[in-house]
């Protein structure tokens, strides 16, 4: 298939992210395929990463993802994790897509992902509190470390947004 | 179970400040935002805004900045709308809603308090 | 802000018919869309939210349907209660209501 015809096919969906910074993959059969991620996301594995700079509820930072066709950050793996944590801020905390909405301590991720209590990383002592429904991602000075908080969620934190790689 | 309960009818007189309540109970009052929807006589809903209960920030709809303000009483589960020098088309039904965990739609309502104009 | 435009404004039916009610947003709307039905003198009840589901409690005679700017609320076997005002309501960009259907037995 002819790029401009990729590229004509790609136009008539709503262009959200206008610049893309892609890597070229060797695949069989004389095809090349890119593999992209959005401007001023980070690239990692399958997937691309956005960091945000400002505060938000946990609600709306997932609008935010999704106005920029992601989600809230859904871990899978300690790779991806230590990936995410690299990038991070020490002084800030940044919510993910985990959450507890009915207060019982059922977590759920935002894409369904099943919540396995054996692949968690969460400060001591954490979960601390049913009123705290959101996860952040934050670091401890005491021990040196990343790890996951549960907060209000309506309290404003920077997030992370996470979306599959785009393929042209 | 998860209740609003408002306080009752006002009658007022144009220029007069009015503060109308919503006490919340059965939940965890500042997990959920709460909004404020006007209601005129015989016409639609119309959002005027909501409070971060946590952090006691407001967001007001482009129709409702100015005369109006939203406020808190957590320690009381409390909501609060005060609508300053009244005018005539500010009388109507006023509702609080909560909004729900994700994705703010209104999953419970106040039962109304109605404002009435008197001359 | 995103507006929405609800249609019909009004709208007669008999008990035991199949109803539509449809909302068209200004914009994308990514099925951040609810639906309410309000009894005379009463609050405003959830019925859908995110544009297909349906709230606890709400019969199945009630669907909704749609995604991007156009959304529908079907009403299938209309039930003496079920007459009353509907509205579809955004909380995407912000909230914004639709002008409301009226549903009145024929």
């Known amino acids: 298939q002819k790029y401009s015809q990729l590229l004509e096919k790609k136009t008539t969906k709503e262009l959200v992210h206008t610049t893309l910074e892609c890597v070229k993959k060797n695949m069989p059969v004389e095809e090349t395929a890119w593999s992209c991620c959005p401007k001023n996301w980070k690239s990692f594995s399958s997937n691309c990463y956005f960091i945000s700079t400002e505060s938000a509820s946990w609600q709306d930072s997932e609008k935010d993802c999704a106005r920029m066709e992601a989600h809230l950050l859904v871990i899978n793996t300690q790779e991806e994790q230590d990936f995410i944590f690299q990038n991070l801020q020490e002084e800030s905390a940044y919510f993910v897509g985990l959450s507890d909405p009915e207060g019982q301590r059922h977590w759920q991720w935002v894409d369904q992902t099943p919540y396995n209590e054996s692949s968690t990383f969460w400060h001591p002592r954490e979960p601390s509190d049913p009123n705290e429904r959101c996860v952040v991602l934050n670091f401890r000075k005491s021990p040196k470390r990343w790890g996951w908080n549960d907060v209000n969620c309506l309290g404003p934190q920077r997030s992370v947004c996470e979306m599959m790689k785009i393929h042209l | 179970q998860i209740q609003l309960v408002q306080s009752g009818p006002e009658l007022k007189k144009p220029g007069e400040t009015v503060k109308i309540s919503c006490k919340a109970s059965?939940?965890?009052?500042?997990?959920?935002?709460m909004n404020w929807v006007k209601q005129a006589p015989g016409k639609g809903l119309k959002w005027m805004g909501w409070i971060n209960t946590y952090t006691g920030e407001s967001t007001y709809a482009d129709d409702f900045k100015g005369r109006f303000a939203f406020s808190l009483e957590t320690s009381a589960s409390t909501a609060y709308l005060q609508i300053s020098n009244l005018k005539n088309e500010d009388m109507a039904t006023y509702f609080c809603a909560r909004g729900d965990f994700r994705y703010y739609y209104f999953d419970y309502w106040g039962q109304g308090t109605t404002l009435t104009g008197s001359s | 802000d995103i507006q929405m435009t609800q249609s019909p404004a009004s709208l007669s039916a008999s008990v035991g018919e199949t109803v539509t009610i449809t909302c068209r947003a200004s914009?994308?709307?990514?099925?951040?869309l609810a639906w309410y039905q309000q009894k005379q003198g009463k609050s405003p009840q959830l019925l859908v939210y995110n544009a297909k589901t349906l709230a606890d409690g709400v019969p199945s005679r009630f669907s909704g349907s749609g995604s991007g700017t156009q959304y529908s609320l079907k009403i299938n076997t209309l039930q003496p209660e079920d007459f009353g005002s509907y509205y579809c309501q955004h909380f995407w960009d912000s909230w914004t209501f639709g002008g409301g259907t009226k549903l009145e037995i024929k």
């Open positions: 914009g994308n709307i990514h099925n951040y």
């Open positions: 059965g939940y965890s009052f500042t997990n959920y935002g």
